[in-house]
């Protein structure tokens, strides 16, 4: 599941990984752009294992990653996979 | 506002079975990304990770005990099981029932029940 | 099993003292770490998360650091209310698993 949160909350994450995640291992993507409270974007990856861990949104890996999902959200699923919150 | 209460047997023998409960109020179980877990210490001891659950009833287990654990939950009735075989003395401690949410930032065990007061003794 | 070994066990101090307690990892855990604080009596309350973020409501003469595998929980001038045990914990990996603890006392 991918998702795009808007929220009004300062930064959740507090220290960020570059390190890649397989496809296979992760459960759940949210995107949080940068702004209402946090001067930068953030991606959080909820892993099978029941962990979770910000990724560097600048790691090579995660950018493949979300650019695969987008052309497959919009060409085979016939309901965003991006989910909005505006508070 | 959180609340987790652990309620069990005071005493029991060896060889018996420990079975515990968890009762919490102020969050549900069923939501993504949460999760009960056990924790105990023994008197003047450290503390030892014991088992979690998760909202999806994924289980993890210290793998220590795992031969003599099983952790479940009622999640409609907001309650978080656990189940000790086979104690001894050593298994004598105060047991705490814990919440961890996976949330950013995540804070495993971010909050604890009173605890109870074990004592295995023949 | 990720081995934490938290120095020093026991410890005695004045008021107004800088303390120092430290955890090992016996392998990476990159932060994942937290210092929990148990008041005699009570159940331990997070007092620090990813090594070096103070939790809500925590003064600010507590700090954490990192030096490679080696983590410490700093009070800059003890206080009496800061009589307790302290205990590390590892989230890096299942098991997760705490130091043994360490008892602060009043000297």
């Known amino acids: 599941v991918l998702e795009v949160y808007y929220t009004s909350l300062r930064c959740r994450c507090v220290q960020e990984s570059s390190v890649f995640i397989p496809r296979r291992f992760i459960d759940r993507i949210q995107i949080l752009p940068r702004g209402n409270g946090c001067p930068r974007k953030e991606i959080i990856v909820w892993k099978k294992n029941k962990s979770i861990v910000c990724v560097d949104p600048q790691a090579e890996w995660i950018q493949r990653m979300m650019e695969v999902l987008r052309k497959r959200s919009s060409s085979t699923l016939p309901v965003p996979v991006f989910k909005r919150k505006i508070p | 506002q959180v609340t987790l209460k652990e309620s069990g047997p005071e005493i029991l023998q060896p060889s018996q079975t420990l079975t515990l409960t968890c009762t919490f109020s102020g969050f549900s179980l069923s939501p993504y990304g949460m999760g009960v877990g056990w924790i105990r210490q023994p008197s003047g001891k450290g503390l030892e990770w014991l088992a979690n659950?998760?909202?999806?009833?994924?289980?993890y287990y210290n793998p220590s005990l795992i031969n003599r654990l099983t952790i479940s939950k009622d999640t409609s009735n907001n309650q978080a099981f656990l189940k000790i075989t086979n104690v001894d003395t050593t298994d004598s401690a105060t047991y705490y029932c814990v919440r961890s949410e996976l949330v950013m930032p995540y804070v495993p065990f971010d909050y604890w029940g009173q605890g109870v007061m074990v004592t295995v003794s023949s | 099993d990720i081995q934490m070994t938290q120095s020093p066990s026991s410890m005695s101090a004045s008021l107004g003292d800088r303390v120092t307690i430290t955890c090992q990892a016996s392998q990476d855990i990159e932060n994942d770490l937290i210092w929990f604080q148990q008041k005699p009596g009570k159940s331990p309350r997070p007092l620090i998360y990813y090594a070096t973020n103070l939790a809500n409501g925590v003064p600010s003469r507590f700090s954490g650091r990192r030096s490679e595998s080696n983590y410490a929980l700093t009070i800059s001038s003890l206080e009496s209310e800061d009589m307790a045990d302290y205990h590390c914990?590892?989230?890096?990996?299942?098991?997760?698993?705490f130091g043994a603890g360490t008892k602060l006392e009043l000297k």
């Open positions: 659950i998760w909202w999806d009833d994924d289980k």
């Open positions: 914990l590892q989230f890096k990996q299942y098991p997760y698993t």
